[in-house]
Amino acid sequence: SPVPFGPEGRLEDKLHKPKATQTEVKPSVRFNLRTSKDPEHEGCYLSVGHSQPLEDCSFNMTAKTFFIIHGWTMSGIFENWLHKLVSALHTREKDANVVVVDWLPLAHQLYTDAVNNTRVVGHSIARMLDWLQEKDDFSLGNVHLIGYSLGAHVAGYAGNFVKGTVGRITGLDPAGPMFEGADIHKRLSPDDADFVDVLHTYTRSFGLSIGIQMPVGHIDIYPNGGDFQPGCGLNDVLGSIAYGTITEVVKCEHERAVHLFVDSLVNQDKPSFAFQCTDSNRFKKGICLSCRKNRCNSIGYNAKKMRNKRNSKMYLKTRAGMPFRVYHYQMKIHVFSYKNMGEIEPTFYVTLYGTNADSQTLPLEIVERIEQNATNTFLVYTEEDLGDLLKIQLTWEGASQSWYNLWKEFRSYLSQPRNPGRELNIRRIRVKSGETQRKLTFCTEDPENTSISPGRELWFRKCRDGWRMKNETSPTVELP
């Protein structure tokens, strides 16, 4: 069933008659050129047809120009993320023009009304860009629109309406309600700029999705599957905020897109990489860690321009805070036999030992089930750079940690009271690093001992052939 927002009103109602009263002089959309990192500094206000502020505030016609576009607001004031983003852009691109599009009067409304205002705000931005294009040396190709939530669709409208094509639009968790399934010209879309990259951090397949679920760019990146963001659980939020509520969880997950983008600006030496995949489940299985044929990319500011014929959905895991980078590994475990498995799936953990560091004990998430006489693929990730892997410890958890598994074990015992020991045979583990694209095979330390059972562990060491490269390109990206 549809989300609980009806139509926005008929086309003929949308003549965009100004709502301002006679006494009101402040325009509904203002363009604030930020001339300092200091949020208290007023900056300069630009307006179409007035060239003096461009000169007074040293607007650099040949440099990159960023337009930051906020979304719907409940407070009617700028939120902290905006100041952080301005500061990060100034730090990274010292000569750039950073313009904050202030449409607070039109955004501080009922959500449905704010949605109805996105078109007129986009049109205002397009008019500003059309005017700037009349100036010598100004190029639309140097324009990068960065829109958060509802602001991402405003950026889409701006790109749609402008005479020509803007260089880039970044959509930071574009709003979902009233845009999910909308016409291509009624939302952010790949047609709106030469390169449209999108970060989705609050999508939900059940209930109301604050962020849009469908891909709307050339590349659409879904960190942590695009839904539950680490560090944003109710417990995390209650721990860090005096009045932690579900609203704070929503804000944390929705706003995470902005912080991932800021991270890509300020921690350019620690870029996060995303990998193309058809869906989140396949990514969780570790199937999608390839960099061939543009299948991986840096996320955020450092993303390489990709204009595929079809949209590219990309996934990655992240840490709970800055720097967000993690190191992804695909683990292929060939199970060549098992005994008396019963109903329950085994719970496996791995510990990776490397030249730089050792990982924590990492769970192997079984997305479907363990197949025998087949290669089972898993995704694991570490927060630290382990360097070259040396050995792996595989542990089969003994006592059940969930009541459900305990109950299944008990039922299993009732039906087969003399159930002999459960056992599984594994000869080798193949590992591929997402970040380096290197592949390595690990063999059991003792070739005679390949069996593992609950409460036991099995050790694997690098097989003789060492690291193998298979014509795979590393995702290492040239920074702009």
Epitope: K14, N160, F161, A182, D183, R310
Partner: antibody, heavy 116, light 107 residues
């Protein structure tokens, strides 16, 4: 209310060109895309392309390989669709439609007959 | 280009019947699908947009559902004025593509 009024029926010879007009009223003309859709006798609907009047941006169906050109005149709130190198299979009713949620409102259609 | 395959191409039904028309996209179009009604000699009319939203003035007997590649238009209780041809269209990407149409005739 929103209205799209199209020009009258045309009869053309193969190889000739036809230019159909669509005059819009009742909404902000410059900020909504206007599409052209055709329907051959007894057949389904076929999207030909669309134009955004404000910036004159266009999107065309590759099938028409440079035979179609869409233009606009903002002073009269009119869009035009010109189809060149006409052939008998171009005989159809040509509709303009304004897009918002979908093709929300349609013109009455213009019949173009291509016959030697 | 995304192909939209509609079925059936025609159907016969009586007043009061529940009628279901399906549309299948050749690739994922999420919920970006619209449905139109066209009567002989008339222009098409928008019924449903974004897969499940009724357009202004459309009677509640018309409903749309589906996402991904499979979509359905349902007329819960067919009225005499509903005998027409129905088209689906994806509006996820350019070029926009229509289904072949379903003609609903009187039994």
């Amino acid at each position: 209310q929103v209205q799209l009024v199209q020009s009258g029926a045309e009869v053309k010879k193969p190889g000739a060109s036809v230019k159909v007009s669509c005059k819009a009223s009742g909404y902000t003309f410059t900020t909504y895309w206007i599409a052209w859709v055709r329907q051959a006798p007894g057949q389904g609907l076929e999207w030909m392309g669309e134009i955004l009047p404000g910036s004159a941006k266009t999107k065309y169906n590759k099938k028409f390989k440079g035979r179609v050109t869409m233009t606009r005149d903002t002073s009269t709130s009119t869009v035009y669709m010109e189809l060149s190198s006409l052939r008998s299979e171009d005989t159809a009713v040509y509709y303009c439609a304004v897009y918002d949620y979908g093709a929300d409102y349609w013109g009455q259609g213009t019949t173009v007959t291509v016959s030697s | 280009d995304i192909q939209m395959t509609q079925s059936p191409s025609s159907l016969s039904a009586s007043v009061g019947d529940r009628v279901t028309i399906t549309c299948k996209a050749s690739q994922d179009v999420y919920t970006a699908v619209a449905w139109y009604q066209q009567k002989p000699g008339k222009s098409p009319k928008l019924l449903i947009y974004s897969a499940s939203y009724r357009f202004t003035g459309v009677p509640s007997r018309f409903s749309g559902s589906g996402s991904g590649t499979d979509f359905t238009l349902t007329i819960s209780s067919l009225q005499p004025e509903d005998f027409a041809t129905y088209y689906c269209q994806q509006h996820y990407s350019i070029p926009r593509t229509f289904g072949g149409g379903t003609k609903v005739e009187i039994k």
